[in-house]
């Protein structure tokens, strides 16, 4: 299993939207992609989960565009706020 986030950093003005890309490789048939936000304290905050058999996930300002064949799960954060400045991680799990 492998997860790749090619964007090392991204800068966007407040109130705009940003899309963070995540590509993965897996041999699992059924799996989940999780998006987390890392606080300055290094604490990881769960944001949203995309299931391999589920519709595109949406939760508040967070939405996922899932492309199953391309093995791509992009996180969009809309109406950006200053508090959104952070490091974001995607993770793969069964």
């Amino acid at each position: 299993q492998k997860v790749t986030q090619a964007q090392s950093s991204v800068s966007m003005p407040v109130r705009k939207a940003v899309t963070l890309n995540c590509l993965y490789e897996t041999s699992w048939w059924s799996y989940y992609i999780f998006w987390y936000k890392q606080l300055p304290s290094k604490e990881m905050i769960f944001l949203i989960r995309q299931g391999s058999d589920e519709q595109n996930a949406k939760s508040g300002r967070y939405s996922v565009n899932f492309k199953k064949a391309a093995k791509s799960v992009a996180l969009t954060i809309s109406a950006l706020q200053l508090e959104d400045s952070a490091k974001y991680f995607c993770a793969l799990g069964e």
Partner: antibody, heavy 117, light 106 residues
Framework: QVQLQQSGAELVRPGASVKLSCKAS????????MYWVKQTPVHGLEWIGA????????AYNQRFKGKATLTSDKSSSTAYMELRSLTSEDSAVYYC??????????WGQGTLVTVSA | QIVLTQSPALMSASPGEKVTMTCSAS?????MYWYQQKPRSSPKPWIY???NLAAGVPARFSGSGSGTSYSLTISSMEAEDAATYYC?????????FGGGTKLEIK
């Protein structure tokens, strides 16, 4: 209303190649993958492969590797499938279908390909 | 790959009759999807995530099942329901379709 307009029927000779097109409208072309499906009376519906128009990433059913090549053109919102070294086994109706996870939510009208000498 | 077997392959029903067709998977799948196809037309999305009806699908249709066994039911057959119905899974790669159940009106 999402539309997938496929190219017209093709009559081709054995051994030749053919390139089918699928023009998408009324949605952001790069936001979802385009899949291709083959339908015959014998084998029913079979997934051929898929392309992500945003990145060009493709995935193929092992059965169709070497037979089909998928491409897309973002500027015209069109997906293409080229079939090579055609035989009678390739005579079928071919559909493009837009994947909205987790299923094939929109389908083109189909293109009939007939391989005959 | 996961093989989907639909039964019966061909069936007929009278108007008003209850109709049930099944789809059996060779391995367990999370959800099943169903499409309706009429002659000289492309497949229409019909039921998604096992039991959710696509927009415009009459309420007399329902879907159910889990694991390796799924079904599509029409509570009261109508003439316009005559068509071929295909099940499809996307739990395993590649996505696969069943061979179809052709439903005719008596």
């Amino acid at each position: 209303q999402v539309q997938l307009q496929q190219s017209g029927a093709e009559l081709v000779r054995p051994g030749a190649s053919v390139k089918l097109s699928c023009k998408a409208s009324d949605y952001k072309f790069t936001d979802s993958e385009m899949y291709w499906v083959k339908q015959t009376p014998v084998h029913g519906l079979e997934w051929i492969g898929a392309i992500d128009p945003e990145t060009g990433i493709t995935a193929y059913n092992q059965r169709f590797k070497g037979k089909a090549t998928l491409t897309s053109d973002k500027s015209s919102s069109t997906a293409y499938m080229e079939l090579r070294s055609l035989t009678s086994e390739d005579s079928a109706v071919y559909y493009c279908t837009r994947a909205v996870p987790p299923w094939f939510a929109y389908w083109g009208q189909g293109t009939l390909v007939t391989v005959s000498a | 790959q996961i093989v989907l077997t639909q039964s019966p392959a061909l069936m007929s029903a009278s108007p008003g009759e209850k109709v049930t067709m099944t789809c059996s998977a060779s391995s367990s799948v999370s959800y099943m999807y169903w499409y309706q196809q009429k002659p000289r037309s492309s497949p229409k999305p019909w039921i998604y995530l096992t039991s959710n009806l696509a927009a415009g699908v009459p309420a007399r249709f329902s879907g159910s099942g889990s694991g390796t066994s799924y079904s599509l039911t029409i509570s009261s057959m109508e003439a316009e329901d005559a068509a071929t119905y295909y099940c499809q899974q996307w739990s395993g790669d590649p996505p696969t379709f069943g061979g179809g159940t052709k439903l005719e009106i008596k």
